[in-house]
Each structure stands twice: as C-alpha cells, then as structure tokens.
Interface confidence: low
C-alpha cells in the first residue's frame, strides 16, 4: 500500500524548493523502476515530484490565504511494464499559517448617516476587519478595535466594531465629520498587526425650511404656433435644506384661463412652465398667472416650518405667428355623374386666413389634367368623365396666401364619378362552337354568359335572344337561363359540310339599366364530319384539321 | 496539417506589455497543450510555458510573475502577454503544440517564429 | 531545474561524415523523455527524435538517437548538405522544460 504522513508546507517560504515528504509505496525497495507522479491542482506547476523516489517539492513561495490546501492524487507505475503499482490515491497538502497578514478593512470606504442631533448612544455604523489568517491557529486572527480620531463626539465597540453617538450634533455648525478606526490581530498584543479605516460620517438633515421664490415676477413669452406641452420658461425657488427635504413641487395657484401648467424637474428643482392649451395671438395675446412652491415631502412634526406657502406672479406675452390658411373642413367628398360635359360644377372648397390681416387665398390643384379650380374654391371638370375609366379622383387642393406665398395648406378632396348605364353588356369572350353533321335537334351547342363595364346599381341582369332574322330561319335556337347565361340549342335534325360548312348567330344582350342597352354578338358555329359516337373531340381534330388546309375523307 | 502562425508588434518598448497571438489552422486547439519558446539572438531556446486548450497554464518559474497566457477556442488561438519587458526579452518567440496529455512534451509543429525587438 | 549541455559546441564535418552530438544532463533524464531538433538559419527548429531514440515521421533514417540517464547521442550517419544546421536537445521529464545550449553542424 501507499506510506505516507500527513503533508505540511509553511507558507511565505523564501527557499526555492521545500522538501514536503515522500509518497511511497510499500512494495518499492529502492531498487525498482517505480516512476510516481503526482495529479490534480498544483501538480506540475506549484509542486513537483521525483518521478523515481516519490519526493514531493514545493517550488513556489506559498500563501496560505490564496489556498490553504491542495488536494492532490498519485499514481505509481513500473516504467519497466507499464502497469499500476498501487491504485491512484488522493492526498492533501496544508498550507501552516503565520501572522502574515494585517486586519484589513474590505468593505471601505465607509460612510454612514445619521440624524443631526440624534441622542448619545445612537448607532452609527459597524465596522468589520478581516484578517486573512487562519483563525483556529493562535489569535493570528482575533481582533480588537479602538478609536484612533472622533472624540468626544463617538466611540468604539472594542470587540464588534460598532460606532455610537457620544455626544449631540448639530448639522448647521458642522455636517460631516471623519473617524478614524483601528483593528489589532493578536488581541493587541506584541507582535500584532493593525489595519486603520477612516468612517466618513454625514449628519442628515431634517426639514426646517421651505422653499422661497427670489424672484416675484417672472416675464416669459410664448409662440402661438407653439404645440401643447411646449416649456416656455423655467422658475426657481431656493430651499436652505439639503436632499430630500430641499425637493420641491411647483403648482399653479391662479390661472383662470386654465392655459398653463407647471411641471417640477426634480433633477435641477426648478420649475417648467408648460402650455396646456394652445394660444391664439388674434384670441388674447398675454395671460398673468400665479405659482407656487411647496416641499415635496414634510414630516408631520415639521408642519409648522412649512404653514404658507412662497407664491410668484408669472406674466406670459403671446407673440404672433403668420399662420397656414385653414380649411373649413380637413377633407371632402364631391360626387358628380360620368359622361357630363366639361366645365361642369364639382364643389367648393374654402379656407381663410386666421390672422388678423385676412389675406386674401388663392386656391390650386396638384397636378390633374380632369379638374381646375378658380379663386372661389370652385372646382369644375375639364374634360367629359368616364366611370368605366376611373371611378374615384384623390385630388390635392392647396391653399395659398396671396400676401405670403409661402403660407400653405393643402387638404386632399375625393371625387367620386357617379355611374350612367352607357355601356351595354358583350360577350365574356370570344365564344367559337361546332355541331356536327349528324346533330339531333335539340342538342346544346354552347352555354354562353355576358359581361357589363356599367356598376351595377343592385345587381346586372341580363336578356340574351336571336335577331329577328336568326329568329325566323335559324337552324338554332337560344335560351335564356335567368341567371345572365343562355345556351345555344339546334333547332333541326342534320348538317351538311359541304353545303353550309360555318354559321354566324346573331345573338342580342340587353341590360336592365335605364334606359336599357343592347348589344349585338357574333356566335360562330363550324359544322364537323363526326364519328358515329358523335365524338367532340373527333369533330375538334376534323375541324382543327380543316383549319391547316387539310382534308380528311 | 495542423499549421501554426505567431502575430503580434515587432516592437515593443522597456517596462511595456508584449503581445503575441498564435493562429492554430488545419486542426482544432481541443486537446491539446500549447507552448511559447523564445530565443535570443545566436542564443539557445528558451521554454517559457504552456497552456491547455481548457485554459490551465505552467510557466517556467524563470518568467512566471510576468507571463500571462489565453486561449480562445472559438477562434482557435493563443495568447501570450510578458510584462514589464527588458532588453533580454528580445527574441524569436515560438509558438508550438505539445502532446496531447501532460506527459508527451516534445514540441511538434512550430509555428515560424516572430522576432520582438525591446529597444526606446 | 536540469541543465542540459551540448558538446560539442560546433562540429566541422564534410558531407557523407559521420556526425556524433552530445547531450549531458545535470541531473537523470529518463530516456523517454529527450528529444532532438534541427533548425536552420531563420527557420523554426524542426522534431528529429522524441523518447531519446525514436524518429519523428519522415525524418530519413539516417538520424538515429540513443542513450539514457544523463548521457545522450545524436548520430547522423551519413552528412548530406540540408543536414548542416543547429541541433538542440530537450528534457521534458521535469518542469520547467529545458533545452541544450545546442551544437552547430557546419560544413568543413
């Protein structure tokens, strides 16, 4: 098995290696190939081992408060086979202290606050040393604490560190003061070490006075063009007191037309007059209102310092802005019906100039080549309309004043083009049929539907029939489904290729509108030689083949 | 092929930092030792420590309070800091892989070398 | 640490000599954990053996290593002329990690 003591190194060695011990294993005589060596944290690096005798070395200077023990494994191996002599085994190195290190204070800088004439005896703050050595070995590590700078007006808990009040402040006299604490290790005896701390002890305040206005009037202008919650100006009172007791909130105490506000910047305790609601020169062009100051927090028992509050009077001038001309609405709607002649009346626009002068307003349209607009507002067409083109104008109309040019607004105006039923319905495409030779009457030869450009008021209805002389000697026949779709039907039994090889059907579509509108469509029909099943697609190669100068017998 | 490039000034003032990075291409860092060797001019060479790709570090005890030594997996690099450098400090610096345990410390390959000048 | 010195300092050999490089440790090394380089004039030393004796891949066989303990050989059999250069020997059985002085191989 392995043979081995427990392994101690003093720290802060000065010698460039420290003999620790010997990791040996029993069943090595001193004439075997044992080859040790050590594993883990440390190895290598802060302790080396002889690979041959197992003795460890500490190469480094080593500080038992940076690590007080290293926890290592060993292993044993015959070079000679390669193989384990002893299992892997784990070990530890102690690190033995000494009084090397001095009682250091890790939470500085301390400060602490406490209430200006707080009672003798108050708790001010407790300080702490720590002494990195190890406190199990003698009183390397045990503290005493004494005050070195403070008196009369503190004192020191020998044993805890605690800081009290000894004597009464007052912060108006002095408001900080410093205190110097020492910590001994080894209870203060010889040979300790000592570490100092310096306390910087703030008296608080409490809320004796309120805050006060310096100036009684303040004169501040604002922009009639200015937007709600623009700052116009700032105020400032004064407060004799420190922190919190010397934040202040400002308020308005009179202000009939309820046009101002005042906000409190709590960073810089001044006070921002703010715009509620906006001015109008040309409405009323100066305003007086009256703030106040008060401390935001005050404590029941400070009442008395903070009975009246300090007020100010505020007069604002309103300057006057050359302003846009406005519109009487902000948008608006025209309706006019399609296919009225040019130069006919749209609406009328209208806007004026706020200002005092009323200049007078010159109106245009943004480029649109459909409508003009005269110096009234009119807007008139100048060209015919057509729905079935464009049935809504997004127009944008600009205001001008003609004493200031560049005084502009502009508002958007929809024109929407009313429908007149001056389209009649067509075919929805181009219809091409065939029917062959052997065709029994009756058979459907085409289902045809149509299409209408006019809007439909409620809803399109169509009436498809034959012209007069399809009517009176057509081969075919048509009927009307109701539902704006009609089939094509024959109307005999039997074609002939050769005689009358194509039809054209004129077929008739009217509208519902008012009055209604007719139109006249071609339906063309090619007669095919068929198969005996009657085969469309026999009829549409035949024809197709036709159609590329073939003839097929 | 694993492929080893140092980077870094050429040179570097007395009392100053030097700063040199070595780029591992071809192969991963992962598993592996990585070492820094030096050599003064017309002098022997100089092992100045390693460090695992895990980021654990031996330094020659000769530089041991002024070496500082980095590696970044990521990027598959290196690094080496000496502070407080003398005219003695002026050398080739090596970058080189170890073996991949702790026990093979043969050093194969090298990267080219970069020589660092201390001068004012 | 182990100190390692190189004999001898500069070999003067002509091409196909036989080249013979000590290296002398202060203190055992053993003979797993030596090993030789080659380097050239503004190159990087370059791995010839590890563990004393074996050959690093593609180092022809004309360089061989041997020893153990505190004595240790290079031996180039037979000089060709990429072979003069500087070549150092190495301990990497004890931290810190030490290299020879080195020897200069130079033509004759």
């Known amino acids: 098995g392995w043979v081995w003591n427990q392994f101690f190194v003093p720290e802060e060695m000065n010698t460039t290696s420290h003999h620790v011990g010997r990791l040996r294993s029993d069943l090595d005589n001193g004439n075997n190939s044992f080859q040790y060596k050590l594993l883990g944290a440390g190895a290598g690096s802060t302790f080396i081992i002889d690979e041959r005798t197992g003795d460890i070395y500490a190469i480094e200077k080593l500080d038992r408060e940076e690590r007080s023990l290293y926890i290592l494994r060993a292993q044993v191996i015959d070079i000679t086979t390669g193989r384990a002599v002893e299992p892997e085994s784990e070990f530890v190195i102690k690190v033995s202290d000494i009084n090397d290190n001095e009682p250091k204070f890790l939470d500085e800088p301390y400060e602490a606050i406490v209430p200006e004439m707080s009672p003798e005896g108050t708790l001010v703050i407790q300080v702490t040393a720590s002494d990195a050595d190890d406190p199990s070995s003698g009183n390397n590590a045990r503290l005493l604490y004494s005050l070195l700078q403070g008196q009369p007006y503190f004192s020191v808990e020998p044993t805890t560190g605690v800081i009290r009040i000894s004597s009464k402040m007052d912060r108006e006299l002095q408001d900080e003061y410093w205190v110097i604490i020492q910590a001994k290790d080894m209870i203060g005896q010889p040979g300790a070490l000592s570490g100092t701390t310096s306390v910087l002890i703030k008296l608080s305040d409490v809320n004796d006075n309120k805050p006060i206005f310096k100036e009684s009037l303040y004169r501040l202008t604002v922009s009639e063009s200015a937007p709600t919650g623009t700052s116009i100006g700032t105020i400032m009172a004064y407060d004799n007191d420190i922190g919190e007791n010397a934040e202040m909130d400002y308020s308005i105490e009179e202000d009939d037309s309820q046009t101002f506000d005042i906000i409190t910047n709590h960073e810089t305790q001044e006070g921002i007059v703010i715009l509620k609601k906006k001015v109008n020169f040309e409405h009323q062009n100066h305003y007086g209102i009256r703030a106040k100051v008060k401390n935001h927090h005050v404590d029941e028992q400070l009442m008395k310092y903070h009975t009246e509050a300090s007020t100010t009077f505020i007069k604002i001038q309103v300057e006057d802005v050359d302003e846009p001309p406005l519109f009487l609405l902000p948008y608006y709607i025209f309706e006019i019906f399609e296919e009225t002649p040019q130069g006919s009346f749209v609406g009328v626009v209208s806007a004026t100039d706020p200002d005092n002068r009323k200049s007078p307003i010159r109106y245009s349209i943004t480029r649109s080549k459909v409508f003009n607009i005269d110096d009234n507002g009119t807007i008139t067409t100048t060209n015919s309309l057509d729905r079935e083109i464009s049935a809504w104008y997004n127009l944008s109309i600009t205001a001008t004043e003609k004493y200031n040019i560049e005084q502009i607004s502009s508002i958007p105006v929809y024109v929407q083009v009313l429908n007149i039923n001056d389209h009649a319905p067509e075919f929805s495409q181009y219809y091409e049929s065939y029917v062959c030779e052997n065709a029994g009457s009756g058979q459907v030869i085409q289902t045809i539907s149509a299409v209408d450009r006019d809007e439909s008021i409620e809803e399109h209805h169509f009436y498809f029939n034959l012209s007069v002389e399809d009517t009176n000697s057509s081969s075919f026949t048509i009927i009307d489904n109701q539902d704006n779709t009609a089939v094509i039907l024959t109307n005999r039994t039997g074609f002939n290729l050769q005689e009358e090889p194509i039809f054209y059907i004129s077929i008739l579509i009217a509208d519902n509108g008012i009055p209604s509108l007719t139109s006249t469509n071609t339906l063309t029909i090619h007669v095919c030689d068929c198969d005996d099943s009657g085969s469309t697609q026999t009829c549409q190669y035949q024809e197709l083949m036709l159609s590329m100068g073939f003839k097929t017998e | 092929q694993v492929q080893l490039q140092e980077s870094g000034p050429g040179l570097v003032k007395p009392s100053e930092t030097l700063s040199l990075t070595c780029t591992v291409s071809g192969g991963s860092i992962s598993g592996y030792y990585w070492s820094w060797i030096r050599q003064p001019p017309g002098k022997g060479l100089e092992w100045i420590g390693y460090?695992?790709?895990?980021?654990?570090?031996n330094y020659n005890p000769s530089l041991k309070s002024r070496v500082t030594m980095s590696v970044d997996t990521s990027k598959n690099q290196f690094s080496l800091k000496l502070s407080s450098v003398t005219a003695a400090d002026t050398a080739v610096y090596y970058c080189?892989?170890?073996?991949?345990?702790?026990?093979?410390?043969?050093?194969?390959?090298w990267g080219q070398g970069t020589l660092v000048t201390v001068s004012s | 640490e182990i100190v390692l010195t190189q004999s001898p300092g500069t070999l003067s050999l002509s091409p196909g000599e036989r080249a013979t490089l000590s290296c002398r440790a202060s203190q055992s090394v053993s003979s797993s954990y030596l090993a030789w380089y080659q380097q050239k004039p503004g190159q990087a030393p370059r791995l010839l053996i590890f563990g004393a004796s074996s050959r690093a891949t593609g180092i022809p066989d004309r360089f061989s290593g041997s020893g153990s303990g505190t004595d240790f050989t290079l031996t180039i059999s037979r000089l060709e002329p990429e072979d003069f250069a500087v070549y150092h020997c190495?301990?990497?059985?004890?931290?810190?990690?030490?290299f020879g002085g080195g020897t200069k191989v130079e033509i004759k």
């Open positions: 460090i695992y790709y895990i980021g654990s570090t």
């Open positions: 080189a892989r170890d073996g991949s345990s702790g026990w093979y410390r043969w050093f194969d390959p």
């Open positions: 190495q301990q990497y059985g004890n931290s810190p990690l030490t």
